[in-house]
Interface confidence: low
């Protein structure tokens, strides 16, 4: 019987306690490898989860998150509530970014604005809760008589803070 079980293909299970040798997986279950003694219950994409890929007899269902939520963890094991740009999710819900920080996404945490002076630059555009500051040439670079051989550093795309 062991040999017979090893011949059971994916999508079936071998149940020696009952009549089947290789029996198709019941509805809402799957076996992704051959020789299985049981079929695994399909993942159910319920509640905040929505189905991205239906379960088949040989592969599990795959889930996404419904609108207003985003995936966390391997294989979207959790759904976390979206916040607005300029906010971060805390245990008490979505909270506005504190002054000096920003978040340009619906997920994740608020991060500090870039410190332009560390790069010898000045703030060209002020930061907001939703956007990082834009750094520009230092005041010395803008003074009369400054060499124009070096073009001003291009402004970074808004919202991309250094990690």
């Amino acid at each position: 019987l062991q040999d017979l079980c090893s011949n059971c293909p994916a999508g079936t299970f071998c149940d020696n306690n009952r009549s089947q040798i290789c029996s198709p997986c019941p509805p809402n279950s799957f076996s992704s490898a051959g020789g299985q003694r049981t079929c695994d219950i399909c993942r159910q994409c319920k509640g905040v989860f929505k189905t991205r890929k239906e379960c088949s007899s040989t592969s599990n269902a795959e889930c996404d998150c419904i609108s207003g939520y985003h995936c966390l963890g391997a294989e979207c094991s959790m759904c976390e509530q979206d916040c607005k740009q300029g906010q971060e999710l805390t245990k008490k819900g979505c909270k506005d970014c504190c002054f000096g920080t920003f978040n340009d996404q619906k997920r994740g945490i608020c991060r500090p604005w870039t410190n332009c002076s560390l790069d010898g630059k000045s703030v060209l555009v002020n930061g907001t809760k939703e956007r990082d500051v834009v750094c520009g040439p230092s005041p010395a670079d803008l003074s009369p008589g400054a060499s124009s051989a070096t073009p001003p550093a291009p402004a970074r795309e808004p919202g991309h803070s250094p990690q």
Epitope: P24, P27, I41
Partner: antibody, heavy 118, light 112 residues
């Protein structure tokens, strides 16, 4: 289409044996177990046993142990049920039924009437 | 052996009305894989039984959606949302969890 066709009615004397055949068509015979169920007049359905059509393994209800034999001929896609030492209580309609999935008998034969009379 | 008990044994119903049949097992029919191993069959007059519901609540292919199965463990129910004339016959529950597979005594549905 998928179907099970059973042999015709039988009239037997007490103490004799009867062998009922069940020919499968429309599917791979060896992929599904075959069960036998009987129904005496006015009685509930009664499960007799099964044969794994692939391996030939069988399992019988204790109520029929020693009197029933379930066999199969894979080349003919046919299952057989033989019941010996017939008694008047064995008068019934005998059905073969395919187990499609998870113990569900999804296809049934048309039934074979077995009469036991002296 | 697992004993299957159905009620009622006789069920007169007016066409268009709902009907409900109960099946109770002497042992739990819930397998460790999460499925309830219980089937429902209809035997129309002069015909072989036909599969309606398997694994407690899954409708067999071609079965009208007015038939539904529910329950878990030891208590199961077959419901017909709106009975039609063609639904007459004897309804049986069956457990395929343990050998010997056993049937209920049957519920005869008839039209009033």
């Amino acid at each position: 289409q998928v179907q099970l066709v059973q042999s015709g009615a039988e009239v037997k004397k007490p103490g004799a044996s009867v062998k009922v055949s069940c020919k499968a068509s429309g599917y791979t015979f060896t992929n599904y177990p075959m069960h036998w169920v009987r129904q005496a007049p006015g009685q509930r359905l009664e499960w007799m046993g099964w044969s794994n059509a692939g391996s030939g393994n069988t399992k019988y209800s204790q109520d029929f142990q020693g009197r029933v034999s379930i066999t199969r001929d894979t080349s003919a896609s046919t299952a057989y049920m033989e019941l010996s030492s017939l008694k008047s209580e064995d008068m019934a309609i005998y059905y073969c039924a395919r187990e499609g999935v998870a113990g569900a008998f999804d296809i049934w034969g048309q039934g074979t009437v077995v009469t036991v009379s002296s | 052996d697992i004993v299957m008990t159905q009620s009622p044994l006789s069920l007169p119903v007016t066409p268009g009305e709902p009907a409900s049949i109960s099946c109770r097992s002497s042992q739990r029919l819930l397998h460790s894989n999460g499925f309830n191993y219980l089937g429902w069959y209809l035997q129309k007059p002069g015909q072989s039984p036909q599969l309606l519901i398997y694994l407690g609540s899954h409708r067999a292919s071609g079965v009208p959606d007015r038939f539904s199965g529910s329950g878990s463990g030891t208590d199961f129910t077959l419901k017909i949302s709106r009975v039609e004339a063609e639904d007459v016959g004897v309804y049986y529950c069956m457990q395929p969890l343990q050998i010997p597979y056993t049937f209920g005594q049957g519920t005869k549905l008839e039209i009033k």
